[in-house]
């Protein structure tokens, strides 16, 4: 503890100018003081100033008043610091002098006298408010106040709390009057040295260095750090915690960005067709009558259906079409024949047989011909018999499909695998995906073919629950659970009724 | 007991950046209340704060070397580090790593043994 | 910049009273520490926040700080205690080191 005690005198009075022992000072008592200030003893007794000691300069003669002064010779009031923390109680003398000598130290000269003493016991608190007395003899009078103050930085009823605001690191912070620390807008914490994070902040996934702030931690965004950050490439998907990838509605593979509702996130067929997922950016569209193309997209000619009959020619007409029979022919698709087998009319070495007593004929045609009159050659593409959009091609009597990359098969259904040809090294499993094969990793094993050996396993600590099974090298420092069924999650913690389509990334 | 303990190159060439880094042992470097600081002693000469930084990453810095001075903190490897660059002979000197102490108003209680570091060419 | 000054040199019998003082700008307003350094050692603790010891210091060794000025003393000095001491304060969020002090036990 540090603090003063402050005596202030005030008044002198010693009319007659006499000393203690009855005489009489000539020419007058040119008076200076000596103050002791001890401990507290019910009997004031002679031996050290436990406390402190000072004296004055000769400050009048015979009775003054005393003026208060600041600094220099005869500050008043009178200071006696201590470096303790303030008991409560005191004792205190106060004796007046007489001397003949020097009036700046008068304590050093030969031949004082004493002319009077005062002794004060008794209680004292610390603080601002002077205590005034006055105390009489026979021959003198002494008016005085004082109190027991702090000493700089120094607070509470003893004195004995050391507080000094500051304004940096190490705390923000101005001192109340018992010593406590009041912390400055925007801080918080036993010494003040902890920001008061933007309101909000999430406290586990958000911290801050200055008021006000809210910084992420990894895997965490938003202006309270308060959104998990998905895993890295997720397209389609949203995360619970950070790294993940649960996928949309319609949507499949390790990133979400396998589109297996491509029909209603896309409507790819045109003019009322009817639109089939296929699996993972499949589609077929299946379409109205009068409509062809891959989305339907195509409007065939009224005349497209060849609805003429027995070499009739189509004519396009506003809403319908028109056949132009031949000879022998009529109806409107040329359906009703006025010829019979003497007329010869089945062309291509087609065999005529007589129908209802040979008022008709019906013609047999040899292989790839067709029609009424056997007057078609066959095109065995028109039933679109090529799949994946696949072309087909007259070969003579047969047919070929020329497939697009990535099918095979007779009508081009087969998808060729990219996984066939074993990418994935290490016994790592391959996926097909829409932009080639992607291989999970055993353990201890990464890299996009799993063809790089890492030291840290991070499938080590088994990670994933219910019998999954883990694998590295999605990515470094990644692992991959395999749910079986029933469970999904990062680490396949969670139970569900429906099997995950893809592992999920942790 | 917390312990400190530098390590880097003692050898450094002028116009180079010295780099030297502080590994925390027996404590967290994610504590609060501490701040982890860098101080360095010529040959013959007195203590000189170079700059702090705690484990949120908030750095202060002695202003006289704060163009040349970057100090960062590795909480996952309880490490904290100094790069000071464009070395001249006047930067030989031994460099202490320190653990400063709010309760202690700042003081530091824990150092590290100091690692002699000279620029000469 | 702020600057706290130490006496180069203080030599003190063995069981007499060293003091050593430390003066900067209003340095009473701020908490000040001393670090003793033995030749060839890292610097020890051995006051902080004006006058308190660290666990492990002979209490011997007390503290003051008031007005410009804080004083470390050391109270019957033994040869063990010759080794440089620095003040330390703090100035906003610098930290400044007084210039050193020898001490000289004869």
């Known amino acids: 503890g540090s603090g003063i005690f402050q005596l202030r005198l005030q008044e002198f009075v010693n009319q007659r100018g006499m000393l203690a022992n009855g005489q009489s000072c000539e020419p007058g008592c040119r008076t200076f003081f000596r103050i002791c200030l001890k401990h507290f003893q019910a009997t004031f007794s002679e031996g050290p100033c436990t406390f402190g000691n000072v004296s004055t300069p000769v400050l009048g003669t015979n009775s003054f008043v005393v003026r208060d002064k600041n600094s220099g010779s005869g500050r008043n009031p009178l200071q006696l610091p201590f470096n303790f923390t303030w008991p409560g109680t005191f004792s205190l003398n106060i004796q007046a002098w007489h001397t003949p000598g020097d009036d700046l130290r008068p304590e050093t000269s030969p031949g004082n006298s004493l002319i009077s003493q005062i002794i004060i016991q008794g209680s004292l608190a610390v603080g601002k408010i002077w205590r005034t007395d006055e105390q009489n003899d026979t021959l003198t009078r002494l008016s005085y106040s004082y109190r027991v103050i702090c000493s700089d930085n120094y607070y509470g009823e003893s004195c004995s709390r050391l507080c000094k605001k500051r304004d940096d690191h190490f705390g923000h912070y101005e001192c109340q009057p018992d010593g406590s620390l009041s912390c400055l807008p925007g801080w918080t914490g036993k010494y003040c040295d902890q920001p008061i994070c933007l309101s909000g902040c999430h406290e586990q996934n958000g911290y801050c260095s200055k008021p006000d702030e809210c910084i992420c931690r990894p895997g965490w965004q938003g202006r309270l750090c308060n959104e998990c950050i998905p895993h890295n490439g997720c397209r389609h998907g949203t995360c619970s915690i950070p790294w993940q990838c649960a996928c949309d509605e319609g949507w499949g593979g390790l990133f979400c960005d396998q589109d297996l509702n491509y029909c209603t996130h896309h409507s790819p067929c045109k003019n009322g067709s009817t639109c089939s997922n296929s699996g993972p950016k499949g589609y077929t569209c299946t379409c109205l009558p009068g409509y062809t193309g891959e989305h339907c997209e195509l409007g065939l000619s009224k005349c497209a259906s060849n609805p003429c009959r027995n070499g009739g020619s189509c004519k396009d007409q506003e809403n319908s079409y028109h056949c132009l029979c031949p000879p022998g022919y009529y109806g409107q698709h040329c359906e009703h024949s006025t010829l019979t087998c003497a007329d010869s009319p089945c062309f291509n070495g087609g065999s005529c047989r007589e129908r209802n007593q040979g008022s008709s004929y019906a013609c047999e045609c040899p292989p790839n011909f067709t029609g009424s009159n056997c007057e078609k050659k066959v095109d065995r593409c028109t039933s679109n018999p090529c799949a994946n959009g696949g072309q087909c091609q007259n070969r003579g009597p047969s047919r070929t499909c020329r497939c697009r990359p990535g099918f095979t098969g007779t009508h081009c259904e087969l998808h060729i695998s990219d996984c066939a040809r074993s990418p994935c090294a290490h016994g790592g499993t391959c996926h097909d995906l829409e932009n080639g094969p992607v291989c999970t990793c055993p353990a201890g094993f990464s890299g996009r073919r799993c063809e790089v050996r890492i030291t840290h396993d991070a499938c080590a600590s088994g990670p994933c629950f219910n019998g999954a099974t883990c694998y590295t090298g999605l990515s470094p420092n990644n692992f991959v659970c395999n749910c079986p069924y029933g469970f999904v999650g990062s680490r396949c913690e969670f139970p569900v009724g429906l099997p995950p389509s893809f592992p999920w990334v942790a | 007991e917390v312990q400190l303990q530098e390590s880097g190159p003692g050898l450094v060439k002028p116009s180079e950046t010295l780099s030297l880094t502080c590994t925390v042992s027996g404590g967290s470097i994610s504590s609060s209340g501490y701040y982890w600081g860098w101080i360095r002693q010529p040959p013959g000469k007195g203590l000189e704060w170079i700059g702090d930084?705690?484990?949120?990453?908030?750095?202060y810095y002695n202003p006289s070397l704060k163009s040349r001075v970057t100090i960062s903190v590795d909480t996952s490897k309880n490490q904290f580090s100094l790069k000071l660059s464009s070395v001249t002979a006047a930067d030989t000197a031994v460099y202490y790593c320190?653990?400063?102490?709010?309760?202690?108003?700042?003081?530091?209680?824990?150092w590290g043994q100091g690692t002699l570091v000279t620029v000469s060419s | 910049s702020y600057e706290l000054t130490q006496p180069p040199s203080v030599s003190v019998s063995p069981g007499q009273t060293a003091s050593i003082t430390c003066s900067g700008q209003r340095l009473g307003d701020k908490y000040a520490s001393w670090y003793q350094q033995k030749p060839g050692q890292s610097p020890v603790l051995v006051i902080y926040e004006d006058s308190k010891r660290p666990s492990g210091i002979p209490e011997r060794f007390s503290g003051s700080n008031s007005g410009d000025t804080a004083t470390l003393t050391i109270s019957g000095t033994q040869p063990m205690d010759e080794a440089d001491y620095y003040c330390q304060a703090w100035d906003r969020d610098t930290g400044v080191f007084g210039y050193g002090t020898k001490v000289t036990v004869l």
């Open positions: 320190a653990r400063e102490d709010v309760i202690l108003r700042g003081g530091s209680d824990y």
């Open positions: 930084i705690n484990y949120a990453g908030s750095t």
